[in-house]
């Protein structure tokens, strides 16, 4: 009886089992009656991620550099490239096909997280006691000034965009 | 429908080079593995070699110093070349596809001055 | 290379009665993948082989249910249940585990 199904690894074709290329390899010609399956390793700048039988493999990705992309991993037969962004920038997709500039945290934000070549930068408001007088893609809320310690006493408050202003204590004369 | 055909000389002198070529149809050279049989008269099947779909070869030892096989996918032509003959080599040379039942009808070579 | 060795050479047999044939080989045939590339032919005067059996036990399309093959490793059998005169011929094993692929003397049957 011919075989309805086949074990892992493997395909039915004309009422036979064949195996399945291993990664890296295309099929070129099915098991017969008298031979095993045909596979061939992929080209160069080709690869195929899968136990298969397709008669052709995937083209690398290309990482354009006029997309802001450069190469995070070369890709091999078994594996696709991996693309990430030039310094500044970050992917606009989790298939890291473009790349736009990180963002900038405005005066009154500070950074909550550097970007990376895949996320933006997270920013987060200042919140008292902090303030960010910059827009910055790297700076964090600093917090303010604390006069005491310098025996100074707050002469202007700080807000979330100012330090405060210290100032000398007024003596008892 | 599936068809392979030898064609090459039906004599040939000891010490020269035959040539012989396989024509095909209904299938392609890319995808379909063919190889090549022989049969001396009154004898047995001898394999000669392969060629394979993705373009490699696989000969008989016996034969190997002496055998050439080649193809020209375009022209679904598979070929075979063998040298310094002798007459030992006077036989039914067959080509075959690698699946299912499909032979040429075969072509005599015979080996002689 | 695999040295296929078949018995009987000849086999005279009675039209309706059983036939078999035996073939050895001088190494396993079963492949790294687990299958075994072992066939049956047979030939009859003036034309080219025909397949029968491919992988020790498998009837090729259009060949009669009275033949059967059966084996593993290094002995193999090929049956016929009833021998019709149609069947005379030469009977050839051959396997296409092993580069070279090699074929068996050949078995002569005949009908008495």
């Known amino acids: 009886e011919p075989p309805t199904a086949c074990r892992e690894k493997q395909y039915l074709i004309n009422s036979q089992c064949c195996s399945l290329c291993q990664p890296g390899q295309k099929l070129v010609s099915d098991c017969t009656e008298f031979t095993e399956t045909e596979c061939l390793p992929c080209g160069e700048s080709e690869f195929l991620d899968t136990w298969n039988r397709e008669t052709h493999c995937h083209q690398h990705k290309y990482c354009d550099p006029n997309l802001g992309l450069r190469v995070q991993q070369k890709g091999t037969s078994e594996t696709d490239t991996i693309c990430t962004c030039e310094e500044g920038w970050h992917c606009t997709s989790e298939a890291c096909e473009s790349c736009v500039l990180h963002r900038s945290c405005s005066p009154g934000f500070g950074v909550k997280q550097i970007a990376t070549g895949v996320s933006d930068t997270i920013c987060e408001p200042c919140p008292v006691g902090f303030f960010s007088n910059v827009s910055s893609a790297f700076e964090k809320c600093h917090p303010w000034t604390s006069c005491e310690t310098k025996d100074l006493v707050v002469q202007q408050a700080g807000t979330n965009k100012t330090d405060v202003v210290c100032g000398p204590q007024d003596r008892l004369r | 429908q599936v068809q392979l055909q030898e064609s090459g000389p039906g004599l040939v002198k000891p010490s020269q080079t035959l040539s012989l070529t396989c024509t095909v149809s209904g299938f392609s050279l890319s995808r379909y593995s063919v190889y090549w049989v022989r049969q001396p008269p009154g004898k047995g099947l001898e394999w000669i070699g392969m060629m394979w779909g993705g373009g490699s070869t696989d000969y008989n030892p016996s034969l190997k110093s002496r055998l050439t096989i080649s193809k020209d996918t375009s022209k679904s032509q598979v070929s075979l070349k063998l040298s310094s003959l002798t007459a030992a080599d006077t036989a039914v040379y067959y080509c075959v596809r690698t699946d299912g039942d499909y032979w040429g009808q075969g072509t005599l070579v015979t080996v002689s001055s | 290379d695999i040295v296929m060795t078949q018995s009987p050479l000849s086999l005279p047999v009675t039209p309706g009665q059983p036939a078999s044939i035996s073939c050895r080989s001088s190494?396993?045939?079963?492949?790294?993948?687990?299958?075994?590339?072992l066939h049956w032919y047979l030939q009859k005067p003036g034309q080219s082989p025909r397949l029968l059996i491919y992988?020790?036990?498998n009837r090729f399309s259009g060949v009669p249910d009275r033949f059967s093959g059966s084996g593993s490793g290094t002995d193999f059998t090929l049956k016929i249940s009833r021998v019709e005169a149609e069947d005379v011929g030469v009977y050839y094993c051959?396997?296409?585990?092993?580069?070279?692929?090699?074929f068996g003397g050949g078995t002569k049957l005949e009908i008495k």
């Open positions: 190494q396993s045939l079963a492949s790294s993948q687990g299958n075994t590339y």
């Open positions: 992988k020790v036990s």
């Open positions: 051959s396997q296409s585990t092993h580069v070279p692929w090699t």
